[in-house]
């Protein structure tokens, strides 16, 4: 069974998948479509790296541009380094600028909805 066939079988169970499962899935060449990706739990999507989302979506990663104003895409973009977003070739803006440190202050983030940044 190839990655695409596997994805079709598990698609309906993905809604509540934790980050760890999504990371594992990104190694399976599943080419998840964007509509399914956007139904995933936001808290499960946010920790995924650009490379992991690229692998998870495959050719459908191109659609992030079309859906950049909607959650969880918008929130995920805000969490990524701009340099990493640039590798997607989509002209996505809003990532963390070069030279900034991301502090994982869970309480701060829970209150504000955005990561805490320290400038260069």
């Amino acid at each position: 069974m190839n990655g695409s066939e596997y994805f079709v079988k598990i698609q309906s169970f993905l809604g509540g998948a934790p980050t760890e499962d999504l990371k594992a899935l990104s190694q399976q060449n599943v080419s998840m479509d964007l509509a399914t990706f956007m139904k995933l739990r936001t808290d499960a999507v946010l920790p995924l790296t650009v490379a992991e989302v690229q692998k998870l979506l495959g050719p459908h990663v191109e659609g992030l541009k079309a859906e950049e104003r909607h959650r969880p895409v918008r929130d995920w973009i805000l969490r990524q380094r701009q340099d990493d977003l640039d590798t997607l070739g989509l002209g996505l803006q809003g990532g963390i600028p070069n030279g900034y440190l991301v502090l994982d202050l869970s309480m701060q983030e829970a209150l504000s909805g955005t990561p805490c940044l320290l400038g260069p």
């Epitope: 080419s31 964007l34 509509a35 139904k39 659609g63 541009k65 997607l88 070739g89 989509l90």
Partner: antibody
Framework: QVQLQQPGTELVKPGASVKLSCKAS????????MHWVKQRPGQGLEWIGN????????YYNERFMSKAKMTVDKSSSTAYMQLSSLTSEDSAVYYC??????????WGPGTLVTVSA | DIVMTQSPSSLAMSVGQKVTMSCKSS????????????LAWYQQKPGQSPTLLVY???TRESGVPDRFIGGGSGTDFTLTISSVQAEDLADYFC?????????FGGGTNLEIK
């Protein structure tokens, strides 16, 4: 304004290969994915695949996996598609098309590939 | 693969008439989160390359005359030309961009009487 330049025609022999070019101008080449589409005379459109011009990552319609190879040259803002082991079934117009998000917002004029001995 | 079916395959209309063509997909093209339908319409005039008319099923591309109206959701879509002009003589294709391989309908050929 956005422009995609493609050669008008390519005449190739059966069994040979051909490398089609698509030179982009009028926009930032690495900010938009490129797609390739096949159209046989009097027939419909067939999606071949898409390529990320920033990383070179490419994805294919399974039907074209062993037929087509897409590449890009960022320095010249040019996308390429090589077609191999050509047969009469490969005689068609091949379009490059710049993505607008997912849809194909700008199309090149197309290259007519004729496979003939 | 998602199968796209267009109808009719051809039609002949007089200038000024209203025309509606149909496109059906074998599965939903609706993103239930964003409410966007992943469907585009293209026009291909004789001897030319296709041009984008409509994306997200109903969003008209910049510069496209407002007589071109996209509609529908889920699996059933339409392209309406509210008042056909002579320059609308062309083939019209729908395309899904929900899941690869992105697939096109067989096209509707519009002739002007």
């Amino acid at each position: 304004q956005v422009q995609l330049q493609q050669p008008g025609t390519e005449l190739v022999k059966p069994g040979a290969s051909v490398k089609l070019s698509c030179k982009a101008s009028g926009y930032t080449f690495t900010n938009y994915w490129m797609h390739w589409v096949k159209q046989r005379p009097g027939q419909g459109l067939e999606w071949i695949g898409n390529i990320n011009p920033s990383s070179g990552d490419s994805y294919y319609n399974e039907r074209f996996m062993s037929k087509a190879k897409m590449t890009v040259d960022k320095s010249s803002s040019t996308a390429y598609m090589q077609l191999s082991s050509l047969t009469s079934e490969d005689s068609a117009v091949y379009y490059c098309a710049r993505s607008g998000g997912l849809w194909l917002a700008f199309w090149g004029p197309g290259t007519l590939v004729t496979v003939s001995a | 693969d998602i199968v796209m079916t267009q109808s009719p395959s051809s039609l002949a209309m007089s200038v000024g008439q209203k025309v509606t063509m149909s496109c059906k997909s074998s599965q939903t093209l609706l993103n239930s989160v964003s409410q966007n339908n992943y469907l585009a319409w293209y026009q291909q005039k004789p001897g030319q390359s296709p041009t984008l008319l409509v994306y997200f099923a109903s969003t008209r591309e910049s510069g496209v005359p407002d007589r071109f109206i996209g509609g529908g959701s889920g699996t059933d879509f339409t392209l309406t030309i509210s008042s056909v002009q002579a320059e609308d003589l062309a083939d019209y294709f729908c395309q899904q961009h929900y899941r690869t391989p992105y697939t096109f309908g067989g096209g509707t050929n519009l002739e002007i009487k």
